[in-house]
Amino acid sequence: DVERTTCPPEKEVHEIDESLIFYKKRELEACVDAALLAAQMDRVDAIPFTYEQLDVLKHKLDELYPQGYPESVIRHLGHLFLKMSPEDIRKWNVTSLETLKALLKVSKGHEMSAQVATLIDRVVVGRGQLDKDTVDTLTAFCPGCLCSLSPERLSSVPPSVIGAVRPQDLDTCGPRQLDVLYPKARLAFQNMSGSEYFVKIRPFLGGAPTEDVKALSQQNVSMDLATFMKLRREAVLPLTVAEVQKLLGPHVEGLKVEEQHSPVRDWILKQRQDDLDTLGLGLQGGIPNGYLILDLSVREALS
């Protein structure tokens, strides 16, 4: 911790400027008034402070604002933002998208950090929901950041906002997040024609249930293998060989390449080998011909 000393009169600080870079850690702690620092935070980012000096400045602000910094300070944190822990950020109340933009710019190259994820979470809480302006800001300044939000936070996205989400914004989303976003996307795009609907819904399909995947197989969508591989395992397993063939169209040949990877591997294990053979791809591992399949889970449910 920084030792307390008294400030020499000639070192007294009346404004935040570049002369401070020559102050030792102890002098900075003793001579910089936290209230002055907070009032002139907009100057800090243009001054080449050392990492050690930034630690002192953070310490000063922490002492002045033990309950969390005001947004007027947060907006101008600059490099100091990257010294904040998620615990620090959780104390903040952030409602301005200008603040979010400023800190996302500082975090470029660090978009998936815990700091950024916590900041976005605070913005969503502060604004009450994940509205279109917030989504637009995230997609513009932080592609992929949408997926840093918890499923609970994503549930506050109105379906009307889904159209602003681009495929690359969903690249890092996990199954639980797509489970939340898919029904909203389905609702948002429900009035579109078949081909247009598929283009729009495709990035969200990692959250689609079996019945919706089956429905798509009837629409000649020619799903690409990358999208198929992102489908939920539970959604793929009940599909028949004929349904998968119709779903993938000309891309069905790609199953051979993905034969050892889930969900393809698990799906193959569920199919009859003679059905797989009809694809002519040499897929192996299906249920041998003549074997009877007993679904014990059904029997357990009945007993």
Epitope: I47, T50, Y51, L54
Partner: antibody, heavy 119, light 107 residues
């Protein structure tokens, strides 16, 4: 006086891993940021990665992102570069260098260690 | 990432000459630019930081200028010890990037 000494270089096959170290002395290691910079034979300097004084922030060049990991042990005054999935184009002299803050240049450099990726 | 472009890539000069090397950034980097000198088989050495500040111990014949996207390194009275390769580097973004280098050789 400030001294940075790299070690761990050598010949390695493509796809394999290597860990470089940089031993620091003559300054308060835990106060300063540390970088790795490399130079392929007969080529220019290429910045590889930086780690902040407390290890809280790390940044990488696109060419090594996902393959290389920069880390530090402040109790041992040592910087590391874990290099995985090595490629022929990673062949270079690797230098460690110090910076004192986000807006500071690289003021002290080690003498470098040669990494050769070849089958 | 910010791209740094140096020119010329090679420069032939004589002892006593005034030499100028240019460095251009793909976007504004304010004054956060450094110049380094490297001799064969040696580590780079910091000459200039913050576009125009001379690093301690560096001879005053070296000077730097510029801001935003255009920068220059000038050696006012080239000495035998100055024949080397010079690099610019931006440190405005956390992903620091170097120029491709300028080799100053004897004419």
């Amino acid at each position: 006086q400030v001294q940075l000494v790299e070690s761990g270089g050598g010949v390695v096959q493509p796809g394999r891993s290597l860990r470089l170290s940089c031993a620091a002395s003559g300054f308060t290691f835990s106060s300063d940021g540390m970088n790795w910079v490399r130079q392929a034979p007969g080529k220019g300097l290429e910045w590889v990665a930086v780690i902040w004084n407390d290890g809280s922030n790390k940044y990488y060049a696109d060419s090594v992102k996902g393959r290389f990991t920069i880390s530090r042990d402040n109790s041992k005054n040592t910087l590391y570069l874990q290099m995985n999935s090595l490629r022929a184009e990673d062949t270079a002299v690797y230098y460690c260098a110090r910076d004192r803050g986000p807006l500071w240049p690289l003021d002290y450099w080690g003498q470098g260690t040669l990494v050769t990726v070849s089958s | 990432d910010i791209q740094m472009t140096q020119s010329p890539s090679t420069l032939s000069a004589s002892v006593g000459d005034r030499v100028t090397i240019t460095c251009r950034a793909s976007q504004s980097i304010s004054r956060w630019l450094a110049w380094y000198q490297q001799k064969p088989g040696k580590a780079p050495k910091l000459l200039i930081y913050k576009a125009s500040s001379l690093e301690s111990g560096v001879p005053s014949r070296f000077s730097g200028s510029g801001s935003g996207t255009e920068f220059t390194l000038t050696i006012s009275n080239l000495q035998p010890d100055d024949f080397a390769t010079f690099y610019c580097q931006q440190y405005n973004s956390y992903s620091r990037t170097f120029g491709q280098g300028t080799k100053v050789e004897i004419k």
